[in-house]
Interface confidence: low
């Protein structure tokens, strides 16, 4: 999916108002310095591409993020504020429902969510028009 035409300011508002808090809740009890940020992004569409990938694509050692509160709110924000996004995700969602069985918070998942926090921070870094 091409995130170029998303309403970035609305997504930013969704992140600041709720998604960020859910990410912090997920990471509660983890030191902020425990994981190094190794994933980055160069512009807002790129950031959303990386955020989508880390949030919804199962990885080795962490297959259980898609049903977390922050993930569901992320999906809702993208569906509302990115034209045509929800249509592209129908097949992926159905496949995910078949695959997902139980919630397991692994160290790998914590690391992945730490990367997500970094990507979201990158997405939300101050714009000049807001200085």
């Amino acid at each position: 999916y091409d995130f170029t035409n998303c309403d970035f300011e609305k997504i930013k508002a969704a992140y600041l108002s709720t998604i960020s808090k859910d990410l912090i809740t997920y990471m509660s009890g983890t030191k902020s310095t425990e994981f190094n940020n190794t994933v980055s992004c160069s512009n807002r569409p790129h950031c959303l591409t990386e955020i989508q990938s880390l949030t919804f694509n199962p990885t080795a050692g962490c297959a259980s993020l898609a049903k977390e509160m922050f993930a569901m709110k992320t999906k809702a924000a993208l569906a509302i504020w990115c034209p045509g996004y929800s249509e592209t995700q129908i097949n992926a969602t159905q496949a995910m429902k078949k695959r997902r069985k139980r919630k397991v918070t692994t160290n790998k998942c914590l690391e992945q969510v730490s990367q997500l926090q970094g990507l979201w921070r990158r997405f939300n870094r101050p714009l000049l028009k807001q200085q």
């Epitope: 902020s32 190094n36 940020n37 980055s40 160069s42 512009n43 970094g118 921070r121 990158r122 870094r125 101050p126 714009l127 000049l128 200085q131």
Partner: antibody
Framework: EVQLVESGGGLVKPGGSLRLSCAAS????????MHWVRQAPGKGLEWVGH??????????DYAAPVKGRFTISRDDSKNTLYLQMNSLKTEDTAVYYC???????????WGQGTLVTVSS | SYELTQPLSVSVALGQTARITCSGD??????VHWYQQKPGQAPVLVIY???ERPSGIPERFSGSNSGNTATLTISRAQAGDEADYYC??????????FGGGTKLTVL
């Protein structure tokens, strides 16, 4: 008002070392990725390197010509950015600017620059 | 390595429109920024993110970016616009890349 003030420049012999400082004020320094950019006399701008904010791990990246010789650090408690320059070469002669990065990888605030001259 | 190419100099008559180009491979896929630098002074950001203007920069300054060329347009050029102009973009390998600079002369 955002302000960046560099200091520490001067004349140094080839192979020598120098440490530049950049004092920041007027914004939350710790939130920003900070950079050094240089400009040789009569030449264009050249990116030297940057240090990310602590929330983004505080890691550094450098341009190829200075990698292994220059080290960027920051002291968020003092709102200060540093550039440690070792094994200086004559081609490092330039005005060194510190700059604040905003979104899109652009530099919205620059210091006035400090001149480093490497000459025997 | 990624390179940005600018003309060494551009001339414009007072009150006319100046266009400064910045060429790079598929530059349209990157955000491009433009800086104005007057002699003995630090650079000043005049356009960021292809076409966004920082507060305090006149509406006469605008930018565009597509394909292999980004363009800084200065309408109704004034004597005070005389300066060196640099384009800049971020590259995944070379990080932050500047063009060689263009000297704008207002006739």
């Amino acid at each position: 008002e955002v302000q960046l003030v560099e200091s520490g420049g001067g004349l140094v012999k080839p192979g020598g070392s120098l440490r530049l400082s950049c004092a920041a004020s007027g914004f939350t320094f710790s939130d920003y990725w900070m950079h050094w950019v240089r400009q040789a006399p009569g030449k264009g701008l050249e990116w030297v390197g940057h240090i990310k904010s602590k929330t983004d791990a505080g890691t550094t990246d450098y341009a190829a010509p200075v990698k292994g010789r220059f080290t960027i650090s920051r002291d968020d408690s003092k709102n200060t950015l540093y550039l440690q320059m070792n094994s200086l070469k004559t081609e490092d002669t330039a005005v060194y600017y510190c700059a604040r990065e905003i979104y899109y990888y652009a530099f919205d605030s620059w210091g006035q620059g400090t001149l480093v001259t490497v000459s025997s | 390595s990624y390179e940005l190419t600018q003309p060494l100099s551009v001339s414009v008559a007072l009150g006319q429109t100046a266009r400064i180009t910045c060429s790079g491979d598929n530059i349209g896929s990157k955000y491009v920024h433009w800086y104005q630098q007057k002699p003995g002074q630090a650079p000043v950001l005049v356009i960021y993110g292809d076409n966004e203007r920082p507060s305090g920069i006149p509406e006469r300054f605008s930018g565009s970016n597509s394909g292999n060329t980004a363009t800084l347009t200065i309408s109704r050029a004034q004597a005070g616009d005389e300066a060196d102009y640099y384009c800049q973009a971020a590259d995944w390998v070379d990080f932050y890349v500047f063009g060689g600079g263009t000297k704008l002369t207002v006739l």
